[in-house]
Structures are given as structure tokens and as C-alpha cells.
């Protein structure tokens, strides 16, 4: 969620504003709705189509291999790096994924899935 | 931080093609949508169209899309503009500029293109 | 395609005024309007994404509001330094489309 700072006299100073969310289907018009304190307010928008097409997923990532197990918190690691981003998608440089230990069969069942995402 | 050095100024007559280079260092060059702009002389910013490094993805303008052609080398972090058949109306300044949308951007310092016989 | 309308074409004001730019757009586009200052011979250098989010290493005296279609541009106390033209742009759609300018010139 974003936050934006919004002075109309004494009136709420901080917005909080949800996603753009599509009226119907994953894209085309809809609506983003707007909290501060007990305010609430809906604003018209728009996802665009061709961007939803294009891109699937608004971030994607180009992961390292599974990190070592860890035994103290029974999880394995791995980093991944902006790889691309739809054009208005605030996402982070670099994310860091955990997942439980497994057996080395499943281990290799999710790390070939995990590389989908690349 | 992203630093965008473009080449030189140029003079070109009508109907030479010219390109134009746009040399990324500092964070990764293949993460962001590069940007193309021009700036007519005394006029408002048009935007021509973009590419994304990673995969070569490019939108364009349609008023652009016989005029302009968008390319990257990743192994030199450079991007280029391509102008083809320009004619004196294409004399503008040209920037290229990175951008992502949780940092803003980063502008190149333009580059001039001249059409004139 | 979106079009953007800038007003006034020219703010004349005196250093220490508030300034107060207004960006019109031709349909609803949510938050995705950014503002630019461009001064002679430079490249444009972004002040404002997302209609009101600041950018690092830009003064807090600018400052900007949205969404929808009607968007402003506030610069708290005028410096000599921001006497120069102000672009708005939209990237809800293609193609990306800048505003006409507001040019801000010292009274």
C-alpha cells in the first residue's frame, strides 16, 4: 500500500492507498480505495491491458541456488534480483526467499520449479 | 546511482539515418526500462518509446514506430536511438533516461541531433 | 492517447511566494503522473512520482497531490533556484505523454 500525505485544512494529513483493483477480469478499469483514520475514500483507475499481458507478474527476479540448510531454523535460503518490472511496479532491487528443509528429492522437485521464475 | 553518458552532437542530412548511444555505469543496466525523449528547439518533451535491456521488449510511440528503432547491448550497459530517413522536423535534442519506479530516474545529458541540407 | 494540460502557461512570482502548478488530464490515471523541472540547457530532473511521492535529494518544499485527474504541483516557498519550466507526465498508458510546461519566472 502507498502512503501520501494529503493537507486540506484540518482534514486527514496521511492517505493510505490500496491497489488498483480491476472492476472486472485482471484488468481495465476499477478502483483504488483510499483509508485515513475512519475516512475511507474510492477513486476511479486503470490497469492497463497491454501491461497485464506483457508482463504476468509485476516483479520478476533472477534467483541464486538454495543456500545450505539451516539447522538452527530448519530453512534454506536463497537471494533473487530484479530481473524486470512492469513500468509502474515499485519492486524491491533484491528479495531473499526461505523455504522448509526438505528431503533431497523434494528439495529437487522445488528448485526446478524455482527456476521458472527467473 | 545510474549514470547515462550519451554521444556526441550530430549533423546529418535529410534522409541519413543517425543513431545514437547511451552508455549506462553504476547500478545494474538490464533491470530498468530505458526511456527515449526528445526536445524540439523552444518546445515541449515527446516521448518516443522504450526497451527493456533484459529482453529487448520495446514499446513504441506509435508516431515513432517508421522513424525510430530501440536497441541495447547489454555487454557494454549501452542503449541506441536510431532515427531513419530523419528530416529537418526531427531536429531536436534526444535523451535517454533509466527508469524504475521505486528509485525515479536518471537522465542522460541529450545529444543533438541536427537535420539540415 | 492521455493528454496532459498545464496552467497557468507562466506563474510570474517573487522568492519566497508559493507556487501552486495544476496538471489536467484527459481521463482518469489513477496516481501515475510524475512532475519534472527542466532548466535551460539541462536535462529534465525529476521532483514528484506517483503524484505525491518525494524523490531523495529533492527539497521538501515541493510537494504534489493527486490522483485522478487533477493534479498539483506545490512548491512551498519559492528559491531562485526553481525559477524554471515544470513538466507533468502520465504513464498509466501508451504512449507516455508529457504536459504542455508551466513556466515559473521571477516576477
Known amino acids: 500500500k502507498k502512503k501520501e500525505k494529503v493537507k486540506k485544512g484540518s482534514e486527514c494529513s496521511e492517505w493510505t492507498w490500496g491497489p488498483c483493483t480491476p472492476s472486472s477480469k485482471d484488468c481495465g478499469m476499477g478502483f483504488r480505495e483510499g483509508t485515513c483514520g475512519a475516512q475511507t475514500q474510492r477513486v476511479h483507475c486503470k490497469v492497463p491491458c497491454n501491461w497485464k499481458k506483457e508482463f504476468g507478474a509485476d516483479c520478476k527476479y533472477k534467483f541464486e541456488s538454495w543456500g545450505a540448510c539451516d539447522g538452527s531454523t530448519g530453512t534454506k535460503a536463497r537471494q533473487g534480483t530484479l530481473k524486470k518490472a512492469r513500468y509502474n511496479a515499485q519492486c524491491q532491487e533484491t528479495i531473499r526467499v526461505t523455504k522448509p528443509c526438505t528431503s533431497k528429492t523434494k528439495s529437487k522437485t522445488k528448485a526446478k520449479k524455482g527456476k521458472g521464475k527467473d | 546511482q545510474v549514470q547515462l553518458v550519451q554521444s556526441g552532437a550530430e549533423v546529418k542530412k535529410p534522409g541519413h539515418s543517425v543513431k545514437v548511444s547511451c552508455k549506462a555505469s553504476?547500478?545494474?543496466?538490464?533491470?530498468?526500462?530505458m526511456n527515449w525523449v526528445r526536445q524540439a528547439p523552444g518546445q515541449g518533451l515527446e516521448w518516443i518509446g522504450m526497451?527493456?535491456?533484459?529482453?529487448?521488449?520495446?514499446i513504441l510511440n506509435q508516431k515513432f514506430k517508421d522513424k525510430a528503432t530501440l536497441t541495447v547491448d547489454i555487454s557494454t550497459s549501452t542503449a541506441y536511438m536510431e532515427l531513419s530517413s530523419p528530416r529537418s522536423e526531427d531536429t531536436a535534442v534526444y535523451y535517454c533516461?533509466?527508469?524504475?519506479?521505486?528509485?525515479?530516474?536518471?537522465w542522460g545529458q541529450g545529444t543533438l541531433v541536427t537535420v539540415s541540407s | 492517447e492521455i493528454v496532459l494540460t498545464q496552467s497557468p502557461a507562466t506563474l510570474s512570482l517573487s522568492p519566497g511566494e508559493r507556487a501552486t502548478l495544476s496538471c489536467r488530464a484527459s481521463?482518469?490515471?489513477?496516481?501515475?503522473l510524475h512532475w519534472y523541472q527542466q532548466k535551460p540547457g539541462q536535462a529534465p530532473r525529476l521532483l514528484i512520482k506517483?503524484?505525491?511521492q518525494s524523490i531523495s535529494g529533492i527539497p521538501a518544499r515541493f510537494s504534489g497531490s493527486g490522483p485522478g485527474t487533477d493534479f498539483t504541483l506545490t512548491i512551498s516557498s519559492v528559491e531562485p533556484e526553481d525559477f524554471a519550466v515544470y513538466y507533468c507526465?502520465?504513464?498509466?498508458?501508451?504512449?507516455?505523454?508529457f504536459g504542455g510546461g508551466t513556466k515559473l519566472e521571477i516576477k
Open positions: 533516461s533509466s527508469w524504475s519506479a521505486k528509485r525515479g530516474d536518471f
Open positions: 553504476g547500478q545494474s543496466f538490464s533491470s530498468y526500462w
Open positions: 526497451i527493456h535491456p533484459s529482453d529487448s521488449e520495446t
Open positions: 481521463e482518469s490515471i489513477s496516481n501515475n
Open positions: 506517483y503524484a505525491s
Open positions: 507526465q502520465q504513464s498509466n498508458s501508451w504512449p507516455l505523454t
